[in-house]
């Protein structure tokens, strides 16, 4: 992975596209920290395992975390 | 459609600066990190430096290292690079480019808009 | 630091040909981090692809990607007039700096 010490965030840039909950194979929510001040949210995609840094702001995703918490309250006892 | 513009280009002579700027617009510009890459005169592409979308991380080729700073101003949808001390060089064009949606140190999405550049010429 | 060397530097073909473009890094490269790109005279660098196989948006299904490890390849399967350019590997490194290789320049027979 290209990460040194001086790197304090993971994301370069962040998308606002939706992301089909089908296709996600983990949904990582990185919270801020000493290194990095601000929520990073990592998508890893089914298809070839890429790896999609998303917008904590934009609404599509806050619609996506919703139906993924949603799913996940579905499957647990 | 998405655009990047770059201006500031001409001649300097050795050891004096210039600011270049590139500014953005068909795209949210806060949302995306960008480079400067330049290319002299017949030569191949070399990148320059790197600033996230928020201007968290800055990076350098060894080369411009403490000569140039790379900023970004997300207000104005701008992009720019102060190049001081510079070196003949340091003559070529320089394109600002924009970083892919969504990449980060786990997966690169590649530099996908470009702009047309604009010709940085350090002589005396 | 990894360095990138591209071959052939110059390669003639005429159109309607396959053109086959060879990308070799001096030490193992996440495919993850591999990028191509093609510069016409006078313009700008396009992406062709990304994550080493992935067509970028608008890139026709001739251009296709491949590889891993040191070795990345680069093809185009019926080269059209307008193929004829100079074409760039680029990698993503730790530190993090994003070096180019000396590029391939496709050339009409």
């Known amino acids: 992975v290209p990460l040194s010490r001086t790197v304090r965030c993971t994301c370069i840039s962040i998308s606002n596209q939706p992301v089909n909950p089908r296709s996600l194979e983990k949904l990582e929510i990185i919270p801020a920290s000493q290194f990095c001040p601000r929520v990073e949210i990592i998508a890893t995609m089914k298809k070839k395992g890429e790896k999609r840094c998303l917008n904590p702001e934009s609404k599509a995703i806050k619609n996506l975390l919703k139906a993924v918490s949603k799913e996940r309250s579905k499957r647990s006892p | 459609q998405m655009q990047l513009v770059e201006s500031g280009g001409g001649v300097v002579q050795p050891g004096r600066s210039l600011r270049l700027s590139c500014t953005a617009s068909g795209f949210t510009f806060s949302n995306n990190g960008m480079h400067w890459v330049r290319q002299a005169p017949g030569k191949g592409l070399e990148w320059v430096a790197v600033?996230?979308?928020?201007?968290?991380?800055?990076f350098y080729v060894d080369s411009v290292k403490g000569r140039f700073t790379i900023s970004r101003d997300n207000s104005k949808n701008t992009l720019y690079l102060e190049m001081n001390s510079l070196r003949a060089e340091d003559t070529a064009i320089y394109y600002c480019a924009r970083e892919g949606d969504g990449s980060g140190i786990y997966y690169y999405y590649g530099m996908d808009v470009w702009g047309q550049g604009t010709t940085v010429t350090v002589s005396s | 630091e990894i360095v990138l060397t591209q071959s052939p530097g110059t390669l003639s073909l005429s159109p309607g040909e396959r053109a086959t473009l060879s990308c070799r890094a001096s030490?193992?490269?996440?495919?993850?981090?591999l990028a191509w790109y093609q510069q016409k005279p006078g313009q700008a660098p396009r992406l062709l692809i990304y994550?080493?196989?992935s067509r970028a948006t608008g890139i026709p299904d001739r251009f296709s990607g491949s590889g891993s490890g040191t070795d990345f390849t680069l093809t185009i399967s019926r080269l059209e007039p307008e193929d004829f350019a100079v074409y760039y590997c680029q990698q993503y490194g730790s530190s993090p700096i994003f070096t180019f290789g000396p590029g391939t320049k496709v050339d009409i027979l």
């Open positions: 030490q193992s490269v996440s495919s993850s981090y």
């Open positions: 600033i996230w979308f928020d201007g968290m991380n800055k």
């Open positions: 994550g080493a196989s």
